[in-house]
Interface confidence: medium
């Protein structure tokens, strides 16, 4: 009981929910559930029955492997899916798959909050703006990654002349996609173009 597998996929893709092991031999019944109690499909006596649900027309069951194919998944399909198998002995066995559907991240826009000469160095404060998403940020100065301490939506740093970069890139990523935004400065410390 309680085999839990995590899956993360991009919205709009086709997904196969399956287990890594073989199904019990000559099982009597196989049912896929969505959020514990909503049946999606049930196989019984050599035929599949698809239930009225938001998946109707988007799912297909392979009784041989137990795999459930879902087409064009959306964020609303985030859930724990349960495959329950009734063995010939009358015992039940179940497998759980936690599906996370993520939208591809949008292209970020870099906003220059502040840029100024400071003690012959260059003070920079840049923000990486994207619509409210849970993402990871990585900043690069001329392709050199900044340290982990700086990996959030705002890059705030004071650069010495030997560390100046011409272009600064913010890479936003989640587990299914990644996009970059770049801003370039005229050395040593003025805006060039976006």
């Amino acid at each position: 009981q309680g085999h839990l597998v995590h899956m993360t996929v991009v919205s709009g893709s086709n997904v196969t929910l399956n287990i890594s092991e073989s199904l019990p031999e000559n099982y009597k019944q196989l049912t896929w559930f969505y959020t514990f109690d909503q049946k999606i499909v049930e196989w019984d006596s050599r035929k599949s029955k698809y239930f009225e649900s938001k998946f109707k027309g988007r799912v297909r069951l392979d009784p041989q492997s137990g795999a459930l194919y879902i087409s064009k998944v959306q964020k609303e399909d985030n859930s724990t899916y349960i495959m329950r198998v009734l063995k010939k002995t009358g015992n039940e066995q179940e497998w759980k798959i936690k599906l996370q559907v993520l939208d591809p991240v949008p292209k970020p826009v870099i906003k220059i909050e502040k840029i100024e000469d400071m003690d012959d160095n260059c003070y920079l404060k840049l923000s990486c703006v994207i619509p409210g998403e849970s993402v990871n940020y990585t900043w690069y100065g001329d392709k050199r990654p900044f340290p982990k301490e700086l990996q959030n939506s705002v890059l705030e740093t004071t650069l010495m002349p030997h560390n100046y970069s011409r272009c600064y890139t913010c890479q936003v990523s989640n587990s299914v996609s990644s996009k970059n935004g770049t801003v370039c400065l005229s050395p040593p410390c003025t805006l060039a173009r976006s």
């Epitope: 400071m118 003690d119 160095n121 003070y123 404060k125 050199r144 990654p145 900044f146 340290p147 982990k148 301490e149 700086l150 959030n152 705002v154 705030e156 740093t157 004071t158 650069l159 010495m160 560390n163």
Partner: antibody
Framework: EVQLVESGGGLVHPGGSLRLSCAAS????????MSWVRQAPGKGLEWVSL????????YYADSVKGRFTIFRDNSKNTLYLQMISLRAEDSAVYYC???????????WGQGTLVTVSS | EIVLTQSPGTLSLSPGERVTLSCRAS???????LAWYQQKPGQAPRLLIY???SRATGIPDRFSGSGSGTDFTLTISRLEPEDFAVYYC?????????FGQGTKVEIK
């Protein structure tokens, strides 16, 4: 000339608290990340904590997380380290240091000694 | 975290000698983000080298750094009396910043 002067060290009992200060001069304090690094007697250097120039971001070594708080007052050009639930292993000279491009530490203050003992 | 191991632990030398200190990282230090510091008794550390090989402002040219990946070296071409101290390497390629345990250069 860049100068960093630490103060606030002393003898404290285990479980006690202490606040260290670092007065900065000779540079635009609010534009630079600052850090605390410590050195136990006769031992090597250990990074403790970091704060961004604006004070908006802070980071801690696992050994002090939840017990130490770094903060700064840019109007007073001063960096602080508030330490609570002190342990014997926190005994060290505590240095404040200016971060150069979030990379290396340059320069350092002269240090202030913290002794945790019953 | 990246562990830095310095060797030897102590070196006993005479003024005028050439010194080579080693710093080995447990994993590759990205883009040679390695610094060397000098610390004399009762004093704060002082930056000598950054970026594995660039001398900090005001550091005499008898100090030089080299290396990349996991192996780095600090060389003092000719020891002066004021060079007897403890030397630390520090990586800043990944968080947390870590230091080596130090090498003591003492007078023979």
């Amino acid at each position: 000339e860049v100068q960093l002067v630490e103060s606030g060290g002393g003898l404290v009992h285990p479980g006690g608290s202490l606040r260290l200060s670092c007065a900065a001069s000779g540079f635009t304090f609010g534009g630079y990340a600052m850090s605390w690094v410590r050195q136990a007697p006769g031992k090597g250097l250990e990074w403790v904590s970091l704060i961004s120039g604006s004070g908006g971001s802070t980071y801690y070594a696992d050994s002090v997380k939840g017990r130490f708080t770094i903060f700064r007052d840019n109007s007073k050009n001063t960096l602080y380290l508030q330490m609570i639930s002190l342990r014997a292993e926190d005994s060290a000279v505590y240095y404040c240091a200016k971060y150069s491009n979030y990379d290396y530490f340059d320069p350092w203050g002269q240090g202030t000694l913290v002794t945790v003992s019953s | 975290e990246i562990v830095l191991t310095q060797s030897p632990g102590t070196l006993s030398l005479s003024p005028g000698e050439r010194v080579t200190l080693s710093c080995r990282a447990s994993q590759s230090v990205s883009s040679s983000y390695l610094a060397w510091y000098q610390q004399k008794p009762g004093q704060a550390p002082r930056l000598l080298i950054y970026g594995a090989s660039s001398r900090a402002t005001g550091i005499p040219d008898r100090f030089s750094g080299s290396g990349s990946g996991t192996d780095f070296t600090l060389t003092i071409s000719r020891l002066e009396p004021e060079d007897f101290a403890v030397y630390y390497c520090q990586q800043y390629g990944s968080s947390p910043r870590t230091f080596g345990q130090g090498t003591k250069v003492e007078i023979k």
